[in-house]
């Protein structure tokens, strides 16, 4: 039985040209996390964090995706096209797969504040 829950940074906004941290946290389960995959709104993979082997940033994103902090992901040099859904997929044993959702809005405004709060989707 899958008992875990994913907490995420929920809905966040950030300035065009700036950076943003995407964070997820898996709790309430003793399952072993084998891999965490970060995916973009069009379902393309941004990065994989393997428990033993570390990070693999996908070639198309190497210039502006940085691993961490922790199991999170930092998106840099944001463009308006980065607006959309992001997913963290936790692959665990023996539970299976947990998935969290974050919505990022990239704002043109120079006064846009980076707002983030942890919430359970």
């Amino acid at each position: 039985m899958m008992t875990g829950t994913i907490e995420t940074t929920g809905n966040i906004s950030a300035k065009k040209g700036g950076s943003v941290i995407l964070q997820c946290h898996l709790s309430s389960t003793m399952a072993q996390v084998t891999q965490v995959n970060w995916e973009q709104h069009d379902h393309s993979l941004l990065a994989i964090r393997n428990a033993e082997l570390g990070w693999h940033i996908y070639p198309a994103f190497k210039d502006r995706v940085a691993p961490g902090p922790g199991l999170g992901l930092t998106l840099q040099s944001l463009t308006m096209n980065d607006t959309g859904e992001y997913f963290c997929t936790y692959h665990t044993y023996p539970d299976g797969t947990y998935r969290g959702r974050i919505f990022l809005e990239v704002l043109e405004s120079s006064v846009a504040e980076h707002s983030a709060r942890f919430q359970i989707p």
Epitope: S44, E52, G54, H56
Partner: antibody, heavy 120, light 107 residues
Framework: EVQLQESGPGLVKPSETLSLTCAVS????????WNWIRQPPGKKLEYIGY???????YYNPSLKSRVTISRDTSKNQFSLKLSSVTAADTAVYYC??????????????WGQGTTVTVSS | DIVMTQSPDSLAVSLGERATINCKAS??????VAWYQQKPGQSPKLMIY???YRYTGVPDRFSGSGSGTDFTLTISSLQAEDVAVYYC?????????FGGGTKVEIK
């Protein structure tokens, strides 16, 4: 260039333990991931598991109860032990390197493979 | 486990013609797919990673495409040295799994 060479007995009796070693040259096993993959005759390649640069291991859950992968950094080699073998473990066994940072789970260097037959 | 199913099992193509190999994943693996070439009597060689990126030294007649569940390896102009068995592999989730292989021969 990275080179990998498997060694070990080609014939193992049922219920015994299969033991193979992979000698690595041209690269240190304290970097990247070192893997065992097998191919039974007429079947798919099957991932057995790996030992990471730090010595942590991952085993395919289907084999986990029978598999041990270890390493000897002083000899720059790593080993596979598979216990309680049956005829279904007859296969070509490959050792391989995986550079996860650059290529994800794609295996970029393979040994030439060694055939292991389980038979009495 | 994710099952990778390749088609066709074998393929005969004339020299200089296009060869197309398909791989279908039992669930969405995004672009976490690699392709390997195994020539007779040799070990597999990495050709494509991340679904569409050629590995170092791989000729540009080889290309990979696809995302989600459907992937393709294309040899744009088959050469004699391309005769081999080709395998796909997913690494979206562990255990990483392989397809059954497609044998490419010359017609």
């Amino acid at each position: 260039e990275v080179q990998l060479q498997e060694s070990g007995p080609g014939l193992v009796k049922p219920s015994e333990t299969l033991s193979l070693t992979c000698a690595v040259s041209g690269y240190s096993i304290t970097s990247d991931s070192w893997n065992w993959i097998r191919q039974p005759p007429g079947k798919k390649l099957e991932y057995i598991g790996y030992i990471s640069y730090s010595g942590n291991t991952y085993y395919n859950p289907s084999l986990k109860s029978r598999v041990t992968i270890s390493r000897d950094t002083s000899k720059n080699q790593f080993s596979l032990k598979l216990s309680s073998v049956t005829a279904a473990d007859t296969a070509v066994y490959y050792c391989a390197r995986l550079d996860f940072s650059n290529y994800g789970g794609a295996v970029d260097y393979w040994g030439q493979g060694t055939t292991v037959t389980v038979s009495s | 486990d994710i099952v990778m199913t390749q088609s066709p099992d074998s393929l005969a193509v004339s020299l200089g013609e296009r060869a197309t190999i398909n791989c279908k994943a039992s669930q969405n693996v995004r672009t976490a797919v690699a392709w390997y070439q195994q020539k007779p009597g040799q070990s597999p060689k990495l050709m494509i990673y991340s679904a569409s990126y050629r590995y170092t030294g791989v000729p540009d007649r080889f290309s990979g495409s696809g995302s989600g569940t459907d992937f393709t390896l294309t040899i744009s102009s088959l050469q004699a040295e391309d005769v081999a068995v080709y395998y796909c592999q997913q690494y979206y989730t562990t255990p990483w799994t392989f397809g059954g292989g497609t044998k490419v021969e010359i017609k």
